[in-house]
Every structure is written in C-alpha cells, then in structure tokens.
C-alpha cells in the first residue's frame, strides 16, 4: 500500500463539510528522522518498514571474495510513497540500502519520470560504514516546489553490473488551480448566443468553476472544471471571467470584454487630392468598425448645379486603401462627395459631405474644314481651318496643335507646331520634296488637347513642277482626301 | 425527466412550526440551488431567498430571516422550509423551484398551501 | 434592491390581439425572465434572459429590452394566454419579481 503523508497545515475550505463525489483524506501524522546535514526541510520521512528487503529489482551476489558463502539479497529499503505538499514549500526525501563492504565504488542515482536527474539539483548521498555493511542513505531535497516538481522520483544503483531500483516516491505539488483554458475577448452580434470556456485544473482536484458577468455570478452554484458558458445574448459590452476554485483557494482569470458588433461609424476627413476634367481623386479616414471588420465603402457623388435632376451616383470600392478615384465626371463642374462604409452589421451614416470641381476639359471636337495647299514659291505649305464648336466644360481655347508627317521614299519624319488661338491658319516650310505632306490639326485649351482632324494629303514635288490645287477636308471632317499631282 | 414534489397543505396555529419539504428527482440534486417563493392570497411572487445544495449555504431575502430557515438532506435530494413562530400573515402558498444559471427558476414544484389560523 | 414595475396591472383583450406587457426596473438589469402563472398552478417559465423561449413556449411569446426597460409581447392571443405574468431580474441579489400583469378577455 502506499503510505501517504499530508501537510498539517490546510488552508480554510472554500465549501465547509465534505464535497459531494469526493473523498476528505484525514491528515497523516509525520514521522520524524534525524538528519546529519544542517538541512531542516519541511517535511521528514521514515522508512516506513525498516527491516523489510525490496523483492523487486535485486542485485543477488553468487559468492563472497573467499568463495565460502552466498550473501543476501541487496535492496533499496521502503520509504514514504507519496508526499503531498503545498507550492513554494521545500521537501526532502531519501532512499536507503545497506550494502556489503566488499563491494566498491557504489554510486545513487537519482530519476525522475524515467529521466535521470543530472547538474544542479540537491542530491547528497551519506556513508554510515560498519564492520560488514556500509549504510547508504540519498537525500533528495527541492527548495520552493513547483508543479513541474510533481512526478515520480526513484534512487538506482549500479553493482556488478547489476541495478538495483527503489520504489518510486510520488511528489504532489498542491497549489491554487490554474488555468489551461480562460475566456477570449469577443465581438458578438446583438441577443445572439455564443459560448465562453474555462478550464482549471489542481492538485487538488476538483476544480470547480464560478462564472462571473459584470461583477455578478452567473452560476449560483460551483460547476466541475471545464465548463462552458452559454451566453444567452447580450445588448450591450460586457465583462466576464471566472474564478477556479479547489481545496487551497480560489484563483480569477482574467477579465474579458465582450464587444456587441454595431454598425460603423461614418467615415471622417473627406479629402481631394487630385482633380482633373473627368475624375476627382478622394481618401478618407475610416470610423470606428464597430467590432466587425469593414466590408466594402460606397462613394456617393451628387451634380451640384440648380439644373441637374439631383441624381446621385454611386461607386462601389473595397474598404482598404481608404482612397478612390471617382471616373466619368462632366468637365469643369461642381460635385458634392460623401463616403459610407460598411460591415457585416450594416452600412454607416454618410461621411460629411464635401464639395469638389473638376477642372478644364480638353476640346472634345476637331477643327473643320481643313485646307492645304503649295506654295512653291515661298517653298512652304498652307494651312487654313475652322474654328471647332467646343462646349463650355473644355474651357477657352488657348490655340491650335498641327501635326505633319513628310513620307518620302520609306522615311517617315512627324513635326508639331503650335498656333495661337486666334489663328486660323499657319505655314509650314517644307521639309522634304518628291514626298508625300500629312496634315492634321487638334484644339488645345488649359484642359488639353482635342481630337486631331483627319488627316489632308498633299504631294510636294520636285522643285519647278507646280499645282496651286489645295487638299482639303469636307466641312464633317471625316474624309482622306489625296491629291495627286 | 426534472421534477420537484412539494409536502400537502398544512394547517397551523398561531405561534406553531412547519416544515414544507421540496424532493428533487431527474437530475443531481448538488448541481443547481433550490429558491424558495410565497405567494400570499390574491398577491404576486416573493423570493425568499435559495439554498446552495453544494455546500448547505442558505442565503435569504430581507424579511425573510430569523424565523425562516431553509435546510436539505442530499442523501434523499430534498430540500427544506421551515418557518417557526407563525403568524396569520404567513399564510401563504410556498414554492420551491431549481435556480439553474442567471437565476432562472427552471422548474417548480406544485406549492404548499400553509394557513395560519387560531 | 431592484425594484420591478409591471405595466399595466390588467391588460383587458381580446383573442388573436397583440398583447405588450411591461417591465421597469429601478436600475439597470443585466436579464429579464418571465413566468406565466395560471390560478391554482405553479409559475410555469416563459422567456429565459430577456428574448430565449423556455422549452415548449410558442413561437407567439417573445421578449425583448435592455438596461431597465423590458416588454414580453404576444402576438395574437390564445384562451389558453389569459394568465398573469411576472418578470424577474438576473443582475443583483436579491432575486425579485415584478408585481405582474393580469391579461384577462375582454
């Protein structure tokens, strides 16, 4: 049987009386054996059955050194079996044998769970040497116990080759519970149950579990260790943790807060950064999520002008990078913008709104009626057009872009030039003769530049062969004419 | 299935005692606590309080201390009222009913009629 | 101690009309549960924490609040829903009941 052996002194119980499924072991009395070291430990063990040989693992020496006759059996003397103490408190515990003189260099070892115990711990074995026999008695002394303490701790000793093997001293480090498990912070929705875990665990077992909701106990009664709570809901933010409670006290997880999911606050700071004729680059800085991550953002863009119908367009974008490049806008016009984001919750409220104006657009239409024509003897082309009919939004006109393109022969040379805007007509030297002259001409405001005109073909001959004859584009701008010298 | 039997009627004189029994069956009678309600004539409910079966610790309601008391017997998973020194205003239909978690009174027993009267 | 008011006392309706009870505690109450209580019977539990329906409730009971206002609504009354009714809070000790609502047919 296993000897058992308790501290004397226990704390209060949290539960007076006895604890329903479970046994009260009364406290054994200590047994007390000198000690030859200045140690003093907390708790002092005897050998239990001095006399008693250990049948287990045995060490049986044939002859003795003269051959003459058998010797007995060796083996480890019983001790306590099993020590029950308090964290932080110290221990010591021994094994004994008496082995016979005619053996040498005799060496204890101790083990713990199956691992031998090397370097730093408190082992200290003693020689009491007789006639015949030398008594060998191994300490084993742990200041401040720990859990990682508990475990089961044997002596061994090698002879002849042989080991011998003590029972095992069971160690039980008793202490408040600890958790393995302790409720997580979340984010629930609204009167939607969820479930919260807590898990202590001893020596001493049980371990019971009190659930506790904003100060208040949920549990009116203790619940055996692991227990789950089944929140029925909540309407609002609340704080739970739980207490474990066992024979040595009471131990509190930490407290969790329990966020209900909303929907988000409105997006703030609205800002442009960028502008042009048809778009209108924005970012803004998101709300709170209201504990739920952000889904998606809407932008929301409303024509500010007494004679729109008041429409508003709306443009989908991801949440994330809070920045969104609003397309498709009316040149050089004023909008109102606001953001609204969303989670699975729901939608916010609509960000202050914010005004913003696109810029100048660029002229939508080409100049009409394009006409070019040699003029051999200045040795330069004429060019004559008309003005393009542009909208307001392209903004005012700021001048003319013609571009001409001289083929001759497989090499192709592009120039441009710029006119003012009160031109309506330019010259261009010549470049190259015996080629073929491309003309096209484009608008330009502050926006910039339009759509080219379709291209007019002139040939420029060699020098001394002349036609006055133009090239020219009819008034709708969308022929190729070619003249052929 | 959970069920909670309650002692028949009693009739008591002035300054007498008694004792109203609440026997629990269909679960661990250890796991929950036992509240304890009257209802006086034609009135509503008033909790008096609840016995903690794990550890025998009674807690009571204001008003209803001194001459209440509340017991068990777990090895029969009966719990216990008793009132002594009764007076006419006791007079009262009492209810024993489990207390499972948020104080949610679960399941009840079918009430004991107590009249007080000389 | 909280206090629990139950509003109005006697709710006088009709079979399939809407019922809304009340409950006002005197400070803020984490859950509300609700009993039904029929003459000459035990309390019978109706609504757990605020809006769970009790095993074999019909879907017709609800209840809904928060802080220190509560409500237990029937939807389209029943003969059999002609009882009265309590609230009970789970925030403080000690335990304590409304003084309930009497809904009686019209």
């Known amino acids: 049987a296993i000897t058992e052996a308790r501290e004397e002194a226990k704390p209060y119980p949290l539960f007076p009386g006895p604890l329903p499924g479970s046994l009260q072991t009364d406290h054994t009395s200590l047994l007390s054996l000198p000690h030859t070291s200045g140690y003093q430990p907390a708790l002092m063990f005897s050998p239990t059955q001095p006399g008693r040989p250990y049948t287990g693992n045995v060490a049986i020496p044939r002859v003795t050194s003269a051959g003459s006759k058998l010797l007995p059996p060796l083996a480890f003397k019983h001790t306590v079996g099993h020590i029950i103490l308090s964290e932080h408190k110290d221990v010591k515990f021994n094994c004994s044998i008496s082995v016979p003189n005619i053996y040498q260099d005799t060496t204890i070892s101790w083990w713990k769970d199956g691992k031998e115990l090397l370097g730093a711990h408190h082992a200290i074995t003693q020689f009491y040497p007789d006639d015949e026999v030398t008594a060998i008695i191994a300490s084993f002394s742990i200041t401040s116990v720990q859990r990682s303490d508990n475990g089961s701790y044997i002596c061994k000793m090698k002879i002849n080759n042989e080991e011998i093997v003590s029972d095992p001293i069971y160690i039980e480090v008793q202490g408040l519970p600890h958790f393995t498990k302790q409720p997580e912070s979340m984010n629930v929705t609204r009167n939607t149950a969820f479930n919260l875990t807590c898990q202590a665990v001893g020596p001493p077992e049980p371990v019971n579990i009190f659930w506790v909701q904003n100060s208040s106990r949920v549990n009116e009664q203790p619940e055996k260790s692991p227990s789950v709570l089944t929140v029925p809901g909540l309407t609002e933010m609340a704080v739970f943790s739980c207490e474990a409670h066992n024979d040595k006290g009471l131990t509190v997880s930490k407290g969790v807060q329990i966020n209900i999911k909303a929907i988000p606050s409105p997006p703030t700071e609205v800002s442009i950064h960028n502008s042009t004729a048809h778009s209108i680059l924005i970012s803004w800085v998101p709300g709170f999520d209201g504990y739920s991550p952000f889904r998606n953002c809407s932008v929301q863009v409303k024509e500010v002008d007494p004679l729109s119908n008041g429409s508003v367009m709306i443009f989908n974008t991801s949440a994330s990078p809070h920045m969104y490049q609003i397309k498709q806008l009316q040149a050089l016009a004023n909008y109102s913008i606001g953001v609204s984001c969303m989670n699975e919750i729901g939608w916010s409220a609509v960000s202050p709104w914010i005004l913003a104006s696109t810029t100048e657009g660029a002229p939508s239409v080409a100049p009409l009626n394009v006409t070019v024509f040699l003029n051999e003897s200045r040795d330069n082309v004429d060019i004559r057009w008309m003005k393009p009919l542009t909208k307001r939004q392209a903004g005012e006109l700021v001048g003319y872009r013609i571009s001409h393109v001289w083929q001759s022969a497989g090499i192709s040379k592009e120039l441009l030039e710029e006119v003012g805007q009160n031109n309506s007509r330019a010259q261009i030297s010549v470049q190259v003769h015996n080629a073929t002259c491309t003309v096209r001409i484009a608008a330009v405001t502050k926006g910039g530049v339009g759509p080219f005109s379709d291209p007019v073909k002139i040939f420029i001959p060699a020098h001394g062969w002349v036609d006055h004859a133009p090239s020219s584009t009819p008034a709708p701008g969308n022929a190729d004419p070619v003249l052929i010298i | 299935q959970v069920q909670l039997v309650q002692s028949g009627s009693e009739l008591k004189k002035p300054g007498a005692s008694v004792k109203v029994s609440c026997k629990a069956s269909?679960?661990?009678?250890?796991?929950?606590?036992v509240h304890w309600v009257r209802q006086a004539p034609g009135q509503g409910l008033e909790w008096m309080g609840w016995?903690?079966?794990?550890?025998?610790?009674?807690t009571y309601a204001q008003g209803f201390t001194g001459r209440f008391v509340f017991s068990l017997d777990t090895s029969v998973s009966t719990a216990y009222l008793q009132i002594s020194s009764l007076k006419a205003e006791d007079t009262a239909v009492y209810y024993c009913?489990?207390?499972?978690?948020?104080?949610?009174?679960?399941?009840w027993g079918q009430g004991t009629l107590v009249t007080v009267s000389s | 101690e909280i206090v629990l008011t139950q509003s109005p006392a006697t709710l006088s309706l009709s079979p399939g009309e809407r019922a809304t009870l009340s409950c006002r505690a005197s400070?803020?109450?984490?859950?509300m549960h609700w009993y039904q209580q029929k003459p000459g019977q035990a309390p019978r539990p109706l609504i757990y924490a605020t809006s769970n329906l009790a095993s074999g409730i019909p879907a017709r009971f609800s209840g809904s609040g928060s802080g220190t206002s509560y409500t237990l609504t029937i939807s389209s009354l029943e003969p059999e829903d002609f009882a009265v009714y309590y609230c009970q809070q789970w925030s403080s000790n000690p335990r304590t009941f409304g003084g309930g609502t009497k809904v009686e047919i019209k």
């Open positions: 016995i903690n079966t794990y550890t025998g610790e009674p």
């Open positions: 269909g679960y661990t009678f250890t796991n929950y606590g």
């Open positions: 400070s803020h109450v984490s859950y």
């Open positions: 009913a489990r207390g499972n978690r948020y104080a949610y009174m679960d399941y």
